[in-house]
Interface confidence: medium
């Protein structure tokens, strides 16, 4: 059994979140995850879910009694979602910590917008597109 | 030229974000995007970036002078990042709108944590794993 299971059960008790009434009005995350099978779509959704949990866990910092549970779960998220890749986790954290109300951050975001947009479509980065461009150039050159 | 380019240039003027000083202290998003080539890693990062822009645009919803630019860019993000898939965009928006300080949301999130964690690793959902399980079962049955 993964280490997070016991600690998540501990948090459930703490939150009184085992009660049947918790399930009222549908799920937060599970229903949405069910909708998406494609790996890249799942990553889009899971990215938001993981950042939600990180924010929630930040709110726990005043209570020592659940620190161990929180740390264990965070560590396990790190393994599962970021493949224990510290750089990936750090980049992710950086993105989640940018303040949308900070004037300098706003200006930078707008400054980078065109390039960010250009990279949004999967095609913008895949080797496939680059290869087809090369072939096209080659064909033109040999005409 | 994609429609967003002209509108992003318009926002740059509005934000005074064309100045060279904007680039001081490095980039927000571009440096991070450069680090990740794998499509699923890129989606993890882009998910945070897109939600940042949506939040930023929400902050400017009352300013009529840039409404057209903002709407055009959002629509183009919708095309590029969500493949014009309304359901995908709606699920994404739902996730970004959950309040981390809402008691009911907190309880639901903890209630769902074990199942969310179980789905975080790519292996947890891919057909590959399902197929290998089927093969394994078949082999056991035929022994």
């Amino acid at each position: 059994q993964d280490p997070y299971v016991k600690e998540a059960e501990n948090l459930k008790k703490y939150f009184n979140a085992g009660h049947s009434d918790v399930a009222d009005n549908g799920t937060l995350f599970l229903g949405i995850l069910k909708n998406w099978k494609e790996e890249s779509d799942r990553k889009i959704m899971q990215s938001q879910i993981v950042s939600f949990y990180f924010k929630l866990f930040k709110n726990f910092k005043d209570d020592q009694s659940i620190q161990k549970s929180v740390e264990t779960i965070k560590e396990d998220m790190n393994v599962k979602f970021f493949n224990s890749n510290k750089k990936k986790r750090d980049d992710f954290e950086k993105l989640t910590n940018y303040s949308v109300t900070d004037l300098n951050v706003q200006r930078k975001a707008i400054h980078e917008l065109i390039q960010v947009m250009a990279e949004l479509s999967p095609a913008a980065k895949t080797g496939k597109r680059k290869r087809s461009q090369m072939l096209f150039r080659g064909r033109r050159a040999s005409q | 030229q994609d429609p967003y380019v002209k509108e992003a240039e318009n926002l740059k003027k509005y934000f005074n974000a064309g100045h060279s000083d904007v680039a001081d202290n490095g980039t927000l998003f571009l440096g991070i995007l450069k680090n990740w080539k794998e499509e699923s890693d890129r989606k993890i990062m882009q998910s945070q970036i897109v939600s940042f822009y949506f939040k930023l645009f929400k902050n400017f919803k009352d300013d009529q002078s840039i409404q057209k630019s903002v709407e055009t860019i959002k629509e183009d993000m919708n095309v590029k990042f969500f493949n014009s898939n309304k359901k995908k965009r709606d699920d994404f928006e739902k996730l970004t709108n959950y309040s981390v300080t809402d008691l009911n949301v907190q309880r639901k999130a903890i209630h769902e944590l074990i199942q969310v964690m179980a789905e975080l690793s790519p292996a947890a959902k891919t057909g590959k794993r399902k197929r290998s399980q089927m093969l394994f079962r078949g082999r056991r049955a035929s022994q």
Partner: nanobody
């Protein structure tokens, strides 16, 4: 949505006492773990006193021995008994649970001669 309501603040002289209370304005709400926070003008909000699930309590150094945090048996109300108040205790006091939910209005405590 649960709303927190703090009460019991006021204007007192140095050395006097106040007892703050906090409860949810509606809905069933339990302070399994919670705390009192304060925010003085121009300063960050800080955690002053904390009570955990197991009734352990923690205080910042400047209020140790003077402030006591407690809650009722049903855990629906949390209190802060403040003795020997000093001018530097002047602030808006807020209660919350851990993890935080949306903040209430707070209650003003002013210590002045």
């Amino acid at each position: 949505q649960v709303q927190l309501q703090e009460s019991g603040g006021g204007l007192v002289q140095p050395g006097e006492s106040l007892r703050l209370s906090c409860a949810a304005s509606r809905g069933i709400f339990r302070f399994n773990a919670g705390g009192w926070y304060r925010q003085a003008p121009g300063k960050q909000r800080e955690l002053v006193a904390f009570i955990g699930v197991d009734n352990t309590t923690r205080y910042i150094d400047s209020v140790k021995g003077r402030f006591t945090i407690s809650r009722d048996n049903a855990k629906t109300t949390v209190y802060l008994q403040m003795n020997s108040l000093q001018p530097e205790d002047t602030a808006v006091y807020y209660c919350n649970k851990v993890p935080y939910i949306d903040w209430g209005q707070g209650t003003q405590v002013t210590v002045s001669s």
